[in-house]
Structure formats: structure tokens, C-alpha cells
């Protein structure tokens, strides 16, 4: 009679003797910023310490009746989901609760900020093991709250937050929109996005992943043995906080970037029905449902990458969009996407000592997205090699000429308003290792990296007839680092990576007609690190 949500986050390959972090999160402390809680509930008794922190606004309405069990309801349930004895994810994790939400579930930005500062000070006074902070709350976008989350994350704390229950773009809310925070949307037992009345889970590029968030059984503050079912992105975030505690207990040295990459890597892929999301948000919303790793061993050898979408550039002629990787991640490739197809490509450029991915809108375009492929590559030395537009009809080429450097991604950027009006090259060179090729009117940018044991290969998939989507995937053991389209495809809307698959999107085929120009070739660059593989074998 295991609750559906706990069954869902347990991978199919799970074996009880294989995934056993020390007492299921016992090395980790989880801070919960929420309502008050019933700490003597049997599910969490002895596992949750109620701090003396309280910063809440007055309840609305003169006739509001403060009933303890109602005041404690939300927080008690979430504490149970994280670390409850019976229905908890990380049954060994200890928790500390801070009251930042009142009996009506309302809080203030200032109260949350002071709560975060309280945690920071506690961490400085008495440093413990890894810390996870669960923020099961969402309010309007707040630059100051996002900045506070960034500061705490850069101090080594893992922050997990609810995407929000407004059936809206999570980027419009805080702390969900803070890039340093792990933002969680909610799915149900059918792996569908959760509907809550007329609203439901938030979505979009600011969501990192989804987790069970409907009909979640957990501790009820009604009585010491009571259980209740609750729904929402708060419950989903609590699952991820629990999974994070399990992972950190098994590998206490994991950085935030490493943890996020692992959460993404071990998630169930492509199980959510995207039709629930607004059409313009489907491509931006990760189709990922959180799960525990099947094993804590052997994860170290993997080359982990994730896709980061920028905000929309807006429609102005010179508008650009920028996608950034986290401080500990390497930008291994950069691509762009425009629903109208009017774009001027993308390029990698240095900004504040780090590479960023910038996409350029074109005249008459409705705007573009920049798409960064962000990877964990220890001891990497990456640079961008650029070739200006070529005079020859063969098109522009650029390769990695430094000894020991391999090609991880190709980008192209052009100044002409619409490359589609220019006849493509007669000869279309095939993709070659360590070489990017593009239109003669375009600048071509090659991302070249040197890292111990890094090897990469180019994989292509071409379709002669027009298709709205062409994909090419990296095989088992290889990780997609670069995704682009070969030149000669005048109607390409853009390219982007979805997990380990490179997707090249084209205009609706009915508008382009079936000509030789309709041919679409998706080019994937697949990499692996022999060094990481050897290192993990030595550890075992």
C-alpha cells in the first residue's frame, strides 16, 4: 500500500540494496519556510525542530477564527512529505521549520527575506552538513527576493521552491523565477500537469522539473495519527527537497549545479502530456518528472548537460535574448529559436568573464529565444573560434585548431535580415569532426573545449522532404552538447536540445512547398568523458 507518489519517484530499476544513502537523508538538514507545524504528529515527531523564527502578517478579516489545526495544516503536511516516517521521501532527514506564512497561508516578501537571513546566520554560527531550504510559496516577481535566494545559493545552500499554482508562466513569480533556485511544477498519478480548480501548476522555462503534486498523502494537523491528501506545487517541491536530501546524504560534496544536473538526468523523460500547457510554452517547459537515482554509484562518470532557455527577446528589430549557465557550468553550445522563423542566429560571447549565449531577432520577427547547453565539465578550458562570412560559395567553415581541443557546439549569426531570401550554397558540405559549416553570409562560431578525456563526435540526420521537425539523438553513454541545423535549410525556425535529442524545427511545411530547399538536416554533437569514467571506477 505504498502511496502512488512514493512509487512514482522510485525508479523501475530500483533495488532495495542498491540505493541506500545513509538513513535516507540523515546527513542533511532541511529548512522549511511555511506555516506553523504540529511537531508532535507521529509522522514527524523528533524529526522536525520548530525554530523560534516567526514573521507573518496579520490574518485578514475581523471574523477570522484562529484554529491551531488549520494554522498548522500546510506546513505539517509538507514536513511529512519531506521526511515523514511512513509517507515521507527522505525518512532520515531532519528538519527545521520557520513560520513565514500565517493561518491563511499568506506571507510577505520581507518576512521571507528575514527568514532566509536567519538561515544564513544559523549556517555561519553553527555550520552543519548540506542544507536544503524548501520554499513552498509563490508571490509576484520580486527582484529583491530572487537576489536573496541567489546569495544563499552561492553560499552553498540548495533552495527548492514551488512553481506556483496559477496556471501561468513561473517566471512571473518569486522565488520561482530565481535561476539559482530549483523550481518544481506538479504532476498527477497519470503524469499530467495538475489542475487545481480553474487554475493549476505553473509552467515555462523557469520550471526545472515536475514532481508528484496531486492527492499526496501526508501528515494532517487534525490529530497525532491523522493523514490527509493535499495537492499543489508545494507538495511537488517537497518531493524534490526530499530527493535532494537523499542525494546529498549519499554525496555530501555535491554542488548545487551538480545536484540540479542529477535531478534532471534521473527524471522520467517525456511522460507529461504537453497539450495541457499553452502552445507558446510547450517548447520552454521541461518534460521531466523527478525520480530518485537508481543507484548512487557510477553517476560521477557521466557528462551531465541541461538546456537553458532565455527569456523572449521581444519583437524589436535589434532585440536580443541571452541564456546563461550557472557559475559552475560550462556553456558548450548555443542555439536559437523563433516561432516566426525570422531571426539572425546566435553567438557565444564573453560577459563578465563567462560565456553566454545571445540570439538575435530579425526585422519583422516576433522575437527570439537563446538556448544554452550547460554542462558539468571539470577542469575544462573552452573558447570560441569565429569565422567571418566567407566569400566562397562553399560557405563559411570554422574548426578547433588547438591541440587537444574538441568541438562541442556550432553557432551561426548573420547580419542580413533574412537568410532565407538568399540562395543556399550549391554544395552542402557534410558535418565533420571539429568543424562547423554554415552559410557564406553568416559568421560561424565553434565552441572548442579541452578537458581530460573529453571526446566528441558529430551525428547527423537529414530528411530530404520538408518536415516540421527533424531529430537526431546521441546513443547511450554519450551526451548531447551541441545542436544545430546544416545550411541550406532556409525555413528553419531554430534548433534546441531536449534531453539527449537535438531537435530542428521548420516552418509549417504547407507554406514552404516541397522543394530541394525543404531538406532539413539536424546536427548533434555527442560527447563523453573517459576521464570521469575512469575516476568513478577508481572510487568504487
Amino acid at each position: 500500500s505504498i502511496p502512488w507518489n512514493l512509487e512514482r519517484i522510485t525508479p523501475p530499476r530500483y533495488r532495495a540494496d542498491e540505493y541506500q544513502p545513509p538513513d535516507g537523508g540523515s546527513l542533511v538538514e532541511v529548512y522549511l519556510l511555511d506555516t506553523s507545524i504540529q511537531s508532535d504528529h507521529r509522522e514527524i515527531e523528533g524529526r522536525v525542530m520548530v525554530t523560534d523564527f516567526e514573521n507573518v502578517p496579520e490574518e485578514d478579516g475581523t471574523r477570522f477564527h484562529r484554529q491551531a489545526s488549520k494554522c498548522d495544516s500546510h506546513g505539517t503536511h509538507l514536513a511529512g512529505v519531506v521526511s515523514g516516517r511512513d509517507a515521507g521521501v527522505a525518512k532520515g532527514a531532519s528538519m527545521r521549520s520557520l513560520r513565514v506564512l500565517n493561518c491563511q497561508g499568506k506571507g510577505t516578501v520581507s518576512g521571507t527575506l528575514i527568514g532566509l537571513e536567519f538561515i544564513r546566520k544559523s549556517q555561519l554560527v553553527q555550520p552543519v552538513g548540506p542544507l536544503v531550504v524548501l520554499l513552498p510559496l509563490a508571490g509576484g516577481y520580486s527582484r529583491v527576493l530572487n537576489a536573496a535566494c541567489q546569495r544563499l545559493a552561492r553560499a552553498g545552500v540548495v533552495l527548492v521552491t514551488a512553481a506556483g499554482n496559477f496556471r501561468d508562466d513561473a517566471c512571473l513569480y518569486s522565488p520561482a523565477s530565481a535561476p539559482e533556485v530549483i523550481t518544481v511544477g506538479a504532476t498527477n498519478a497519470q503524469d499530467q500537469p495538475v489542475t487545481l480548480g480553474t487554475l493549476g501548476t505553473n509552467f515555462g522555462r523557469c520550471v526545472d522539473l515536475f514532481a508528484p503534486g496531486e492527492d499526496i498523502i501526508g501528515a494532517s494537523s487534525d490529530c497525532s495519527t491523522c493523514f490527509v491528501s493535499q495537492s499543489g506545487t508545494s507538495q511537488a517541491a517537497a518531493h524534490v527537497a526530499g530527493i535532494a536530501a537523499m542525494m546529498l546524504s549519499a554525496e555530501p560534496e555535491l554542488t548545487l549545479a551538480e545536484l540540479r544536473q542529477r535531478l534532471i538526468h534521473f527524471s522520467a523523460k517525456d511522460v507529461i502530456n504537453e497539450a495541457w500547457f499553452p502552445e507558446d510554452q510547450r517548447v520552454l517547459t521541461p518534460n521531466l518528472v523527478a525520480a530518485l537515482p537508481p543507484s548512487t554509484h557510477g553517476a560521477g562518470w557521466q557528462l551531465f548537460c541541461r538546456t537553458v532557455w532565455s527569456a523572449h527577446s521581444g519583437p524589436t528589430r535589434m532585440a536580443t535574448a541571452v541564456a546563461r549557465c550557472a557559475p559552475d557550468e560550462e556553456l558548450l553550445s548555443c542555439s536559437s529559436f523563433s516561432r516566426s522563423g525570422k531571426r539572425r542566429g546566435e553567438r557565444m560571447e564573453a560577459q563578465g568573464g563567462k560565456l553566454v549565449c545571445r540570439a538575435h531577432n530579425a526585422f519583422g520577427g516576433e522575437g527570439v529565444y537563446a538556448i544554452a547547453r550547460c554542462c558539468l565539465l571539470p577542469q575544462a578550458n573552452c573558447s570560441v573560434h569565429t569565422a567571418p562570412p566567407a566569400e566562397a560559395s562553399m560557405g563559411t567553415r570554422v574548426h578547433c585548431h588547438q591541440q587537444g581541443h574538441v568541438l562541442t557546439g556550432c553557432s551561426s549569426h548573420w547580419e542580413v535580415e533574412d537568410l532565407g531570401t538568399h540562395k543556399p550554397p550549391v554544395l552542402r558540405p557534410r558535418g565533420q569532426p571539429n568543424q562547423c559549416v554554415g552559410h557564406r553570409e553568416a559568421s560561424i562560431h565553434a565552441s572548442c573545449c579541452h578537458a581530460p578525456g573529453l571526446e566528441c563526435k558529430v551525428k547527423e540526420h537529414g530528411i530530404p522532404a520538408p518536415q516540421e521537425q527533424v531529430t537526431v539523438a546521441c546513443e547511450e553513454g554519450w551526451t548531447l552538447t551541441g545542436c544545430s541545423a546544416l545550411p541550406g535549410t532556409s525555413h528553419v525556425l531554430g534548433a534546441y536540445a531536449v534531453d539527449n535529442t537535438c531537435v530542428v524545427r521548420s516552418r509549417d511545411v504547407s507554406t514552404t512547398g516541397s522543394t530541394s530547399e525543404g531538406a532539413v538536416t539536424a546536427v548533434a554533437i555527442c560527447c563523453r568523458s573517459r576521464h570521469l569514467a575512469q575516476a568513478s571506477q577508481e572510487l568504487q
Epitope: S1, D23, D40, R42, E43, E45, G46, R47, G84, R85, D86, A87, K91, G92, I217, S220, D222, C223, S224, T225, C226, F227, V228
Partner: antibody, heavy 119, light 113 residues
Framework: QVQLVQSGAEVKKPGESLKISCKGS????????ISWVRQMPGKGLEWMGW????????HYNPNFQGQVTISADKSISTAYLQWSSLKASDTAMYYC????????????WGQGTLVTVSS | DIVMTQSPDSLAVSLGERATINCRSS????????????LAWYQQKPGQPPKLLIY???TRESGVPDRFSGSGSGTDFTLTISSLQAEDVAVYYC?????????FGQGTKVEIK
Amino acid sequence: QVQLVQSGAEVKKPGESLKISCKGSGYSFTDYYISWVRQMPGKGLEWMGWIYPGDSYTHYNPNFQGQVTISADKSISTAYLQWSSLKASDTAMYYCARDRWSTPYFDVWGQGTLVTVSS
Amino acid sequence: DIVMTQSPDSLAVSLGERATINCRSSQSVLYSSNNKNYLAWYQQKPGQPPKLLIYWASTRESGVPDRFSGSGSGTDFTLTISSLQAEDVAVYYCQQYSSFPITFGQGTKVEIK
């Protein structure tokens, strides 16, 4: 089948120590709470406390706090009730029983252990 | 603590007749979270451990004859044996399991008249 098997009857003198056991089988021992219940001769049932074998956390009835110690060894699916210094008033039948979050009532009981304390 | 009070203390009923035992809790054991009453009934025969008969105030445990039924809500509960059989001679206990310490009624002894 699911069962809780308790250790045999004990006859002790006042001041002696004692540890009685309750072994679970036929189910996942760490998924259930084990409670101990006292029944003095000719009297009713009194709940003494529970232990969660998964983390060995205990919760005692205030009336029994400090009088007895509840423990468990999950590796052998066994819970224990012990006294460091028995009194004549500890003479009773002691039962173990199991419950869990979805079934918080006692659905399976041990056969009981009779403890007699007499000088 | 929640105090459980049973009535009567003992009951003598003819074979085939109805036996009714009452149980009152000092505070409600009905909770809105799942709309359930956290109350159980147990039967204890001489020399045996208690046996679960009824849980959630009215749900019969599997294998328990259907002549046993539970009813009531909030603070007042009843165990009914619709047609007393010889094997039903025992002491019956009600129990609340919503808060600690868990408490039992003092017991009702059922005999054959």
C-alpha cells in the same frame, strides 16, 4: 503469515532487570510501529508507548515514562520492552501490537508475555 | 488525555439476542481531514490477546462475522452484536487512536444469560 511472536513467561524478584521481546514476521518490520500494552491481573488495557523500528524513535505514555525502555533491532525484526529494576506492581501480561499510518489501529497482536514479580 | 468510558461494565444476554455496548470519548475523535472517527473495538477472550473487530468506528475487520457492527460519530459510539453466540463471550474494549497517549475504555464483559 503476518505474526508477532513474544518471548516466554518470566518470574522475577523485585529489583531485578528484565528484557522481553516481540519478533515480527511476514511483513516489512520497519514499515510499522510497535506498541506495548499492559494488562494487570483482572484489569483493562493500558497503552505504554510505541517505537518506530525504522529509526528507533520512541514515544511513551507519560504514566510509563522512566519506568520502562522500549527498543528495537531492525536487523532481526525484534522489538523489546525492558525494566532495570522490577517492582511487584509490574506483575502483568504484556502485549506487543503493530499499526501504521494507513491503519493506525492494532491489527496484529502478539500472544502476550506474562511477567510475575514476587519475592 | 482522551478518556474513554464504556457502559455497561457487564452485560448478560440470552443466546440469539442483541447485545449493545456503548462507548463515550471525552472529546471528539472525528476529524475533518478524512471525515473518519478514530475509534476501534476489540474482543478479548480469556487467556488470549485482544482481537480487532471494528475500526474507523464502523468498518468490520476481515474475517469478523457480520453480526458485529459499529456505529456512532464524534463522541458517542456503539458496538452491536445482533444475535449473540456462545463464542462471543468475552470482554470488549473501545479504543481511540487519534492522539497520544492511546486510551482504551475500561472494558465491558459480555456473558450469556
